[in-house]
Amino acid sequence: PGPPPGSPRASPDPRAELDSTVLLTRSLLEDTRQLTIQLKDKFPADGDHNLDSLPTLAMSAGALGALQLPSVLTRLRADLLSYLRHVQWLRRAMGSSLKTLEPELGTLQTRLDRLLRRLQLLMSRLALPQLPPDPPAPPLAPPSSTWGGIRAAHAILGGLHLTLDWAVRGLLLLKTRL
Protein backbone atom coordinates (compact mmCIF):
# COMPACT_ATOMS: atom_id res chain seq x y z
CA PRO A 1 0.00 0.00 0.00
CA GLY A 2 1.01 3.61 -0.20
CA PRO A 3 1.64 6.53 -2.47
CA PRO A 4 4.75 6.78 -4.59
CA PRO A 5 7.51 6.93 -1.99
CA GLY A 6 8.23 10.61 -1.51
CA SER A 7 6.24 13.66 -0.70
CA PRO A 8 6.95 17.38 -1.02
CA ARG A 9 8.16 19.18 2.08
CA ALA A 10 4.90 20.31 3.64
CA SER A 11 6.04 22.03 6.81
CA PRO A 12 9.17 23.61 8.30
CA ASP A 13 12.13 21.59 9.51
CA PRO A 14 12.39 21.69 13.35
CA ARG A 15 15.52 23.84 13.08
CA ALA A 16 13.63 26.35 10.92
CA GLU A 17 10.78 26.05 13.42
CA LEU A 18 13.21 26.95 16.20
CA ASP A 19 14.42 29.97 14.19
CA SER A 20 10.89 31.28 13.75
CA THR A 21 10.15 30.59 17.43
CA VAL A 22 13.17 32.73 18.38
CA LEU A 23 11.91 35.53 16.09
CA LEU A 24 8.43 35.34 17.58
CA THR A 25 9.87 35.35 21.13
CA ARG A 26 12.02 38.39 20.28
CA SER A 27 9.07 40.32 18.88
CA LEU A 28 7.01 39.39 21.95
CA LEU A 29 9.89 40.59 24.16
CA GLU A 30 9.86 43.92 22.29
CA ASP A 31 6.04 44.16 22.63
CA THR A 32 6.38 43.58 26.37
CA ARG A 33 9.16 46.17 26.66
CA GLN A 34 7.08 48.81 24.85
CA LEU A 35 4.02 47.99 26.95
CA THR A 36 6.06 48.26 30.16
CA ILE A 37 7.30 51.70 29.06
CA GLN A 38 3.70 52.77 28.37
CA LEU A 39 2.53 51.44 31.73
CA LYS A 40 5.34 53.22 33.61
CA ASP A 41 4.59 56.41 31.72
CA LYS A 42 0.87 56.38 32.53
CA PHE A 43 1.07 54.76 35.97
CA PRO A 44 4.56 55.30 37.46
CA ALA A 45 5.71 52.40 39.65
CA ASP A 46 7.08 52.94 43.13
CA GLY A 47 9.75 50.23 43.16
CA ASP A 48 9.40 46.56 42.17
CA HIS A 49 6.07 44.76 42.39
CA ASN A 50 5.45 41.08 43.01
CA LEU A 51 2.47 38.79 42.52
CA ASP A 52 2.54 35.48 44.41
CA SER A 53 0.65 33.66 41.64
CA LEU A 54 3.35 34.38 39.03
CA PRO A 55 5.94 31.69 38.24
CA THR A 56 9.42 32.19 39.64
CA LEU A 57 12.05 32.97 37.02
CA ALA A 58 13.05 29.70 35.42
CA MET A 59 16.82 30.11 35.32
CA SER A 60 19.58 32.66 35.40
CA ALA A 61 21.14 33.24 32.00
CA GLY A 62 24.47 31.98 33.34
CA ALA A 63 23.04 28.58 34.25
CA LEU A 64 21.55 27.99 30.81
CA GLY A 65 24.51 26.02 29.52
CA ALA A 66 23.68 22.97 31.60
CA LEU A 67 20.06 22.79 30.51
CA GLN A 68 18.58 20.09 28.32
CA LEU A 69 16.20 20.79 25.45
CA PRO A 70 13.15 19.06 27.01
CA SER A 71 13.46 20.82 30.36
CA VAL A 72 13.83 24.25 28.73
CA LEU A 73 10.81 23.82 26.46
CA THR A 74 8.63 22.19 29.13
CA ARG A 75 9.40 24.87 31.72
CA LEU A 76 9.05 27.68 29.20
CA ARG A 77 5.67 26.40 28.06
CA ALA A 78 4.41 26.07 31.66
CA ASP A 79 5.58 29.60 32.56
CA LEU A 80 4.14 31.18 29.42
CA LEU A 81 0.79 29.45 30.01
CA SER A 82 0.75 31.06 33.45
CA TYR A 83 1.56 34.50 32.00
CA LEU A 84 -1.14 34.06 29.36
CA ARG A 85 -3.63 33.34 32.13
CA HIS A 86 -2.47 36.44 34.03
CA VAL A 87 -2.74 38.69 30.96
CA GLN A 88 -6.28 37.40 30.35
CA TRP A 89 -7.13 38.06 34.00
CA LEU A 90 -5.63 41.54 33.82
CA ARG A 91 -7.68 42.46 30.76
CA ARG A 92 -10.88 41.14 32.36
CA ALA A 93 -10.34 42.62 35.80
CA MET A 94 -8.89 45.96 34.75
CA GLY A 95 -10.69 46.55 31.45
CA SER A 96 -11.72 50.16 32.11
CA SER A 97 -8.64 51.23 34.12
CA LEU A 98 -6.16 49.90 31.55
CA LYS A 99 -8.07 50.75 28.39
CA THR A 100 -5.24 53.12 27.46
CA LEU A 101 -3.09 50.00 27.02
CA GLU A 102 -5.50 48.40 24.55
CA PRO A 103 -5.20 47.16 21.82
CA GLU A 104 -1.57 46.43 22.81
CA LEU A 105 -2.56 44.08 25.65
CA GLY A 106 -4.83 42.19 23.27
CA THR A 107 -2.03 41.87 20.73
CA LEU A 108 0.30 40.64 23.48
CA GLN A 109 -2.23 37.98 24.47
CA THR A 110 -2.65 36.81 20.85
CA ARG A 111 1.10 36.59 20.27
CA LEU A 112 1.66 34.79 23.56
CA ASP A 113 -0.92 32.21 22.52
CA ARG A 114 0.81 31.84 19.14
CA LEU A 115 4.20 31.33 20.81
CA LEU A 116 2.72 28.61 23.03
CA ARG A 117 1.35 26.81 19.94
CA ARG A 118 4.76 27.10 18.26
CA LEU A 119 6.53 25.63 21.30
CA GLN A 120 4.14 22.71 21.43
CA LEU A 121 4.57 22.02 17.73
CA LEU A 122 8.34 22.08 18.17
CA MET A 123 8.09 19.58 21.03
CA SER A 124 5.86 17.34 18.88
CA ARG A 125 8.23 17.45 15.91
CA LEU A 126 11.20 16.58 18.10
CA ALA A 127 9.15 13.96 20.02
CA LEU A 128 10.14 15.44 23.37
CA PRO A 129 8.17 14.56 26.50
CA GLN A 130 5.08 16.73 26.72
CA LEU A 131 4.10 16.96 30.34
CA PRO A 132 0.49 17.90 31.00
CA PRO A 133 0.02 21.51 32.10
CA ASP A 134 -0.24 21.96 35.86
CA PRO A 135 -3.75 21.44 37.17
CA PRO A 136 -5.73 24.65 36.82
CA ALA A 137 -4.80 27.05 39.61
CA PRO A 138 -7.63 28.57 41.63
CA PRO A 139 -9.13 31.58 39.87
CA LEU A 140 -7.18 34.77 40.43
CA ALA A 141 -8.94 37.07 42.85
CA PRO A 142 -9.94 40.45 41.45
CA PRO A 143 -7.58 43.23 42.56
CA SER A 144 -8.59 44.89 45.81
CA SER A 145 -8.37 48.34 44.19
CA THR A 146 -7.50 50.05 40.94
CA TRP A 147 -4.02 50.71 42.28
CA GLY A 148 -3.73 47.03 43.27
CA GLY A 149 -4.52 46.11 39.67
CA ILE A 150 -1.93 48.54 38.35
CA ARG A 151 0.69 47.06 40.67
CA ALA A 152 -0.30 43.61 39.37
CA ALA A 153 0.13 44.86 35.78
CA HIS A 154 3.65 46.05 36.61
CA ALA A 155 4.48 42.67 38.16
CA ILE A 156 3.02 40.66 35.23
CA LEU A 157 4.74 42.67 32.49
CA GLY A 158 8.03 42.79 34.42
CA GLY A 159 8.02 39.04 35.02
CA LEU A 160 7.02 38.28 31.44
CA HIS A 161 9.85 40.48 30.17
CA LEU A 162 12.41 38.57 32.25
CA THR A 163 10.97 35.20 31.19
CA LEU A 164 11.02 36.10 27.48
CA ASP A 165 14.58 37.42 27.77
CA TRP A 166 15.57 34.07 29.34
CA ALA A 167 13.62 32.26 26.61
CA VAL A 168 15.46 33.98 23.73
CA ARG A 169 18.84 33.12 25.25
CA GLY A 170 17.77 29.56 25.99
CA LEU A 171 16.32 28.92 22.53
CA LEU A 172 19.42 30.32 20.81
CA LEU A 173 21.61 28.05 22.90
CA LEU A 174 19.42 25.05 22.13
CA LYS A 175 19.66 25.78 18.42
CA THR A 176 23.34 24.92 18.56
CA ARG A 177 22.44 21.46 19.93
CA LEU A 178 19.86 20.58 17.32
Epitope: Q120, L126, Q130
Partner: antibody, heavy 114, light 111 residues
Framework: EVQLLESGGGLVQPGGSLRLSCAAS????????MHWVRQAPGKGLEWVAV????????YYADSVKGRFTISRDNSKNTLYLQMNSLRAEDTAVYYC???????WGQGTLVTVSS | QSVLTQPPSASGTPGQRVTISCSGS?????????VHWYQQLPGTAPKLLIY???ERPSGVPDRFSGSKSGTSASLAISGLRSEDEADYYC???????????FGGGTKLTVL
Amino acid sequence: EVQLLESGGGLVQPGGSLRLSCAASGFTFSSYGMHWVRQAPGKGLEWVAVISYDGSYKYYADSVKGRFTISRDNSKNTLYLQMNSLRAEDTAVYYCAAGVPDYWGQGTLVTVSS
Amino acid sequence: QSVLTQPPSASGTPGQRVTISCSGSSSNIGSDYDVHWYQQLPGTAPKLLIYSNNERPSGVPDRFSGSKSGTSASLAISGLRSEDEADYYCAAWDSSLSGPVFGGGTKLTVL
Protein backbone atom coordinates in the same frame (compact mmCIF):
# COMPACT_ATOMS: atom_id res chain seq x y z
CA GLU B 1 11.61 15.53 -1.66
CA VAL B 2 10.99 13.67 1.60
CA GLN B 3 11.24 9.90 1.39
CA LEU B 4 10.59 7.26 4.04
CA LEU B 5 11.01 3.69 2.88
CA GLU B 6 10.03 0.82 5.19
CA SER B 7 11.34 -2.73 4.80
CA GLY B 8 11.50 -5.97 6.78
CA GLY B 9 7.81 -6.90 6.78
CA GLY B 10 6.59 -10.38 5.93
CA LEU B 11 4.92 -13.51 7.25
CA VAL B 12 5.94 -14.70 10.70
CA GLN B 13 4.56 -17.30 13.12
CA PRO B 14 3.01 -16.33 16.48
CA GLY B 15 5.78 -15.91 19.05
CA GLY B 16 8.29 -15.05 16.32
CA SER B 17 10.33 -11.91 15.74
CA LEU B 18 10.83 -9.36 12.97
CA ARG B 19 12.92 -6.24 12.60
CA LEU B 20 11.51 -3.39 10.53
CA SER B 21 13.73 -0.66 9.08
CA CYS B 22 12.88 2.75 7.68
CA ALA B 23 15.38 4.55 5.46
CA ALA B 24 14.91 8.34 5.42
CA SER B 25 16.08 10.91 2.89
CA GLY B 26 15.24 14.42 1.71
CA PHE B 27 15.14 15.98 5.18
CA THR B 28 17.31 16.39 8.29
CA PHE B 29 16.52 13.04 9.89
CA SER B 30 18.41 13.86 13.11
CA SER B 31 16.14 16.86 13.76
CA TYR B 32 12.90 14.89 13.78
CA GLY B 33 11.18 12.65 16.27
CA MET B 34 10.15 9.42 14.54
CA HIS B 35 7.08 7.22 14.95
CA TRP B 36 5.84 3.79 14.03
CA VAL B 37 2.08 3.70 13.36
CA ARG B 38 0.19 0.60 12.28
CA GLN B 39 -3.07 -0.14 10.52
CA ALA B 40 -4.73 -3.54 10.75
CA PRO B 41 -6.57 -4.62 7.57
CA GLY B 42 -9.76 -2.58 7.20
CA LYS B 43 -9.16 -0.78 10.53
CA GLY B 44 -8.02 2.65 11.70
CA LEU B 45 -4.58 4.01 12.59
CA GLU B 46 -2.93 2.91 15.83
CA TRP B 47 0.19 4.60 17.18
CA VAL B 48 2.86 2.05 18.17
CA ALA B 49 6.01 3.86 19.34
CA VAL B 50 7.92 7.14 19.14
CA ILE B 51 11.57 8.06 19.60
CA SER B 52 12.90 11.58 20.11
CA TYR B 53 15.19 13.30 17.60
CA ASP B 54 18.33 12.25 19.50
CA GLY B 55 17.09 8.86 20.70
CA SER B 56 16.98 9.84 24.38
CA TYR B 57 13.21 9.45 24.80
CA LYS B 58 11.15 6.43 23.75
CA TYR B 59 7.45 5.82 24.33
CA TYR B 60 5.28 2.81 23.48
CA ALA B 61 1.61 1.99 23.19
CA ASP B 62 0.45 -0.31 26.01
CA SER B 63 -0.37 -3.03 23.46
CA VAL B 64 3.32 -3.43 22.48
CA LYS B 65 5.16 -2.43 25.67
CA GLY B 66 7.80 -4.99 26.63
CA ARG B 67 7.65 -6.70 23.23
CA PHE B 68 8.65 -4.00 20.73
CA THR B 69 11.76 -1.78 20.79
CA ILE B 70 12.17 1.41 18.75
CA SER B 71 15.66 2.68 17.92
CA ARG B 72 17.41 4.94 15.44
CA ASP B 73 20.81 5.44 13.87
CA ASN B 74 21.17 9.11 12.93
CA SER B 75 24.47 8.46 11.15
CA LYS B 76 22.60 6.11 8.77
CA ASN B 77 19.33 8.09 8.63
CA THR B 78 17.51 4.92 9.64
CA LEU B 79 14.72 4.07 12.07
CA TYR B 80 14.15 0.55 13.42
CA LEU B 81 11.41 -1.43 15.14
CA GLN B 82 12.39 -4.72 16.76
CA MET B 83 9.23 -6.81 17.25
CA ASN B 84 9.38 -9.86 19.53
CA SER B 85 6.71 -12.28 20.84
CA LEU B 86 4.48 -11.43 17.88
CA ARG B 87 0.76 -12.13 18.10
CA ALA B 88 -1.99 -12.49 15.50
CA GLU B 89 -3.34 -9.07 16.53
CA ASP B 90 -0.03 -7.45 15.48
CA THR B 91 -0.94 -8.17 11.84
CA ALA B 92 -1.02 -4.77 10.12
CA VAL B 93 0.64 -2.40 7.69
CA TYR B 94 3.40 -0.66 9.66
CA TYR B 95 4.12 2.95 8.71
CA CYS B 96 7.22 4.90 9.65
CA ALA B 97 6.42 8.59 10.14
CA ALA B 98 8.41 11.75 10.93
CA GLY B 99 7.60 14.74 13.11
CA VAL B 100 4.05 15.49 14.17
CA PRO B 101 3.87 13.10 12.12
CA ASP B 102 4.23 15.34 9.07
CA TYR B 103 5.58 12.71 6.68
CA TRP B 104 4.70 9.05 6.23
CA GLY B 105 6.28 6.12 4.43
CA GLN B 106 4.30 3.82 2.15
CA GLY B 107 4.11 1.07 4.79
CA THR B 108 5.25 -2.55 5.07
CA LEU B 109 2.87 -5.43 5.75
CA VAL B 110 3.47 -7.68 8.76
CA THR B 111 1.38 -10.85 8.89
CA VAL B 112 1.44 -13.00 12.03
CA SER B 113 -0.11 -16.37 11.31
CA SER B 114 0.55 -20.07 11.76
CA GLN C 1 -11.99 1.48 21.03
CA SER C 2 -10.18 4.71 20.07
CA VAL C 3 -9.24 7.34 22.64
CA LEU C 4 -10.54 10.10 20.34
CA THR C 5 -14.10 9.68 19.10
CA GLN C 6 -15.10 10.41 15.49
CA PRO C 7 -18.30 9.59 13.62
CA PRO C 8 -17.66 6.48 11.51
CA SER C 9 -19.08 8.07 8.37
CA ALA C 10 -20.04 11.38 6.80
CA SER C 11 -21.33 12.33 3.38
CA GLY C 12 -22.13 15.28 1.19
CA THR C 13 -22.75 16.29 -2.39
CA PRO C 14 -20.22 18.14 -4.56
CA GLY C 15 -19.96 21.82 -3.58
CA GLN C 16 -21.39 21.22 -0.11
CA ARG C 17 -19.70 21.93 3.22
CA VAL C 18 -19.08 18.95 5.51
CA THR C 19 -17.85 18.94 9.11
CA ILE C 20 -16.21 16.01 10.92
CA SER C 21 -16.02 16.09 14.71
CA CYS C 22 -13.38 14.68 17.05
CA SER C 23 -14.10 14.36 20.75
CA GLY C 24 -11.41 13.80 23.35
CA SER C 25 -10.85 14.17 27.08
CA SER C 26 -8.92 16.16 29.67
CA SER C 27 -5.77 14.07 29.08
CA ASN C 28 -5.51 14.96 25.37
CA ILE C 29 -7.47 17.68 23.54
CA GLY C 30 -8.69 19.20 26.81
CA SER C 31 -5.12 19.47 28.16
CA ASP C 32 -4.40 22.16 25.59
CA TYR C 33 -2.62 19.71 23.29
CA ASP C 34 -2.88 20.52 19.60
CA VAL C 35 -5.06 18.51 17.25
CA HIS C 36 -3.83 17.29 13.85
CA TRP C 37 -5.90 15.90 10.98
CA TYR C 38 -4.91 13.28 8.38
CA GLN C 39 -6.43 12.29 5.06
CA GLN C 40 -6.02 8.72 3.83
CA LEU C 41 -7.07 8.17 0.24
CA PRO C 42 -7.99 4.57 -0.67
CA GLY C 43 -4.91 2.33 -0.83
CA THR C 44 -2.43 5.03 0.19
CA ALA C 45 -0.56 6.18 3.29
CA PRO C 46 -2.03 8.93 5.49
CA LYS C 47 -1.18 12.54 4.64
CA LEU C 48 -1.03 15.49 7.06
CA LEU C 49 -3.97 17.77 6.30
CA ILE C 50 -4.16 20.16 9.28
CA TYR C 51 -1.67 20.64 12.11
CA SER C 52 -1.80 22.67 15.33
CA ASN C 53 -5.61 22.82 15.26
CA ASN C 54 -5.95 25.07 12.23
CA GLU C 55 -2.68 25.30 10.29
CA ARG C 56 -2.48 23.96 6.74
CA PRO C 57 0.74 22.47 5.37
CA SER C 58 1.82 23.92 2.04
CA GLY C 59 -0.08 22.34 -0.82
CA VAL C 60 -3.29 21.72 1.15
CA PRO C 61 -6.19 23.73 -0.33
CA ASP C 62 -7.87 26.36 1.85
CA ARG C 63 -11.13 24.43 1.45
CA PHE C 64 -9.85 22.44 4.45
CA SER C 65 -9.94 24.12 7.85
CA GLY C 66 -9.71 23.03 11.47
CA SER C 67 -10.89 24.34 14.81
CA LYS C 68 -10.70 23.34 18.44
CA SER C 69 -12.72 24.17 21.54
CA GLY C 70 -12.47 22.57 24.97
CA THR C 71 -12.16 18.80 24.60
CA SER C 72 -13.37 18.71 20.98
CA ALA C 73 -12.09 19.59 17.54
CA SER C 74 -13.55 19.63 14.06
CA LEU C 75 -12.46 19.50 10.45
CA ALA C 76 -14.49 21.43 7.88
CA ILE C 77 -14.33 20.79 4.14
CA SER C 78 -16.06 23.36 1.95
CA GLY C 79 -16.73 23.10 -1.76
CA LEU C 80 -16.69 19.31 -1.52
CA ARG C 81 -15.11 17.47 -4.47
CA SER C 82 -15.18 13.85 -5.54
CA GLU C 83 -11.43 13.56 -4.85
CA ASP C 84 -12.10 14.36 -1.17
CA GLU C 85 -13.61 10.88 -0.75
CA ALA C 86 -11.27 9.33 1.83
CA ASP C 87 -10.83 8.37 5.47
CA TYR C 88 -10.10 11.27 7.84
CA TYR C 89 -8.36 10.86 11.20
CA CYS C 90 -7.82 13.28 14.07
CA ALA C 91 -4.83 12.91 16.40
CA ALA C 92 -3.51 14.57 19.57
CA TRP C 93 -0.91 13.94 22.24
CA ASP C 94 -2.24 12.14 25.31
CA SER C 95 -0.48 12.80 28.61
CA SER C 96 -1.76 9.62 30.27
CA LEU C 97 -0.34 7.46 27.46
CA SER C 98 2.79 9.58 26.80
CA GLY C 99 2.15 9.41 23.08
CA PRO C 100 -0.17 10.50 20.32
CA VAL C 101 -3.64 9.03 20.00
CA PHE C 102 -5.80 8.75 16.88
CA GLY C 103 -9.51 8.92 16.35
CA GLY C 104 -11.22 5.86 14.87
CA GLY C 105 -11.49 7.57 11.48
CA THR C 106 -14.39 8.95 9.48
CA LYS C 107 -15.14 7.61 6.02
CA LEU C 108 -16.26 10.53 3.85
CA THR C 109 -18.45 9.71 0.87
CA VAL C 110 -19.12 12.24 -1.87
CA LEU C 111 -22.57 11.43 -3.22
